[in-house]
């Protein structure tokens, strides 16, 4: 996978595949779904299902489409103007501090706590103290402390625009 960079044969990106449409940049920028050519004179379309761009840009390359991991479902496919939208499978969720993986939702709250929020693709079940109503930290309790309950009804898929 190597190519000599030459004057005569600029970048292979400029030898566009048949599906790669070209247009001229507007004020130096290319529209969503395109990237700019090496000389800045052309806009070249991203490759459907492979890469994308979401905004007017002067990017040399379109961005690689995300591929959903195992344990995720694809809510919408990658297009030339929008990245893939992936969501954790039912019974799992994605935390802000570990966004690269879906974690299993807890099946119940610790003793003395009551469930007030269901497992969703973006949050674990939510537990509060019966008396005070304060939230539980989210640490998984020791097995013997766990009061099991059936997982909540799965949330309807969130609509993410991108």
């Amino acid at each position: 996978e190597s190519a000599l960079i030459t004057q005569q044969d600029l970048a292979p990106q400029q030898r566009a595949a048949p599906q790669q449409k070209r247009s001229s940049p507007s004020e130096g920028l290319c529209p969503p779904g395109h990237h700019i050519s090496e000389d800045g004179r052309d806009c070249i379309s991203c490759k459907y299902g492979q890469d994308y761009s979401t905004h007017w840009n002067d990017l040399l390359f379109c961005l690689r489409c995300t591929r959903c991991d195992s344990g995720e479902v694809e809510l919408s496919p990658c297009t030339t103007t929008r990245n893939t939208v992936c969501q954790c499978e039912e019974g799992t969720f994605r935390e802000e501090d570990s966004p690269e993986m879906c974690r299993k939702c807890r099946t119940g709250c610790p003793r003395g706590m009551v469930k007030v929020g269901d497992c969703t693709p973006w949050s674990d079940i939510e537990c509060v103290h019966k008396e005070s109503g304060t939230k539980h930290s989210g640490e998984v309790p020791a097995v013997e402390e766990t009061v099991t309950s059936s997982p909540g009804t799965p949330a309807s898929p969130c609509s993410l625009s991108g």
Epitope: I5, G40, D51, L59, L63, R64
Partner: nanobody, 124 residues
Framework: EVQLVQSGGGLVQAGGSLRLSCAAS????????LGWFRQAPGKEREFIAA????????YGVDSVKGRFTISRDNAQNMGYLQMNNLKPEDTAVYRC?????????????????WGQGTQVTVSS
Amino acid sequence: EVQLVQSGGGLVQAGGSLRLSCAASGRAFSNYALGWFRQAPGKEREFIAAINWNGENRYGVDSVKGRFTISRDNAQNMGYLQMNNLKPEDTAVYRCAAALSFRLGGEPYGDAYWGQGTQVTVSS
């Protein structure tokens, strides 16, 4: 996060060749475009070459066209800059960078991850 470790610099005579390597670890290297920059003493950093995530698209500035080859091997998490017919004016510290893409002027798009840099000295 991506970590980049460079190797392959050194001292070479004018007209000679060097191959710079950029070894990636951490998050999926194949999601990122790879760029090469250089900075000569007392000069601004210069964007010289880039390659997209799958190696299909490449970019090079006029000063290195016909002499430098950019490539990558996603299976090995490696990026390369093959430099032939080196000139004294190529003397600089060379750094690789990984980013989602690069803008026409060389500015990384999104978070950029940088190699530590390697000295290339071309003697006349």
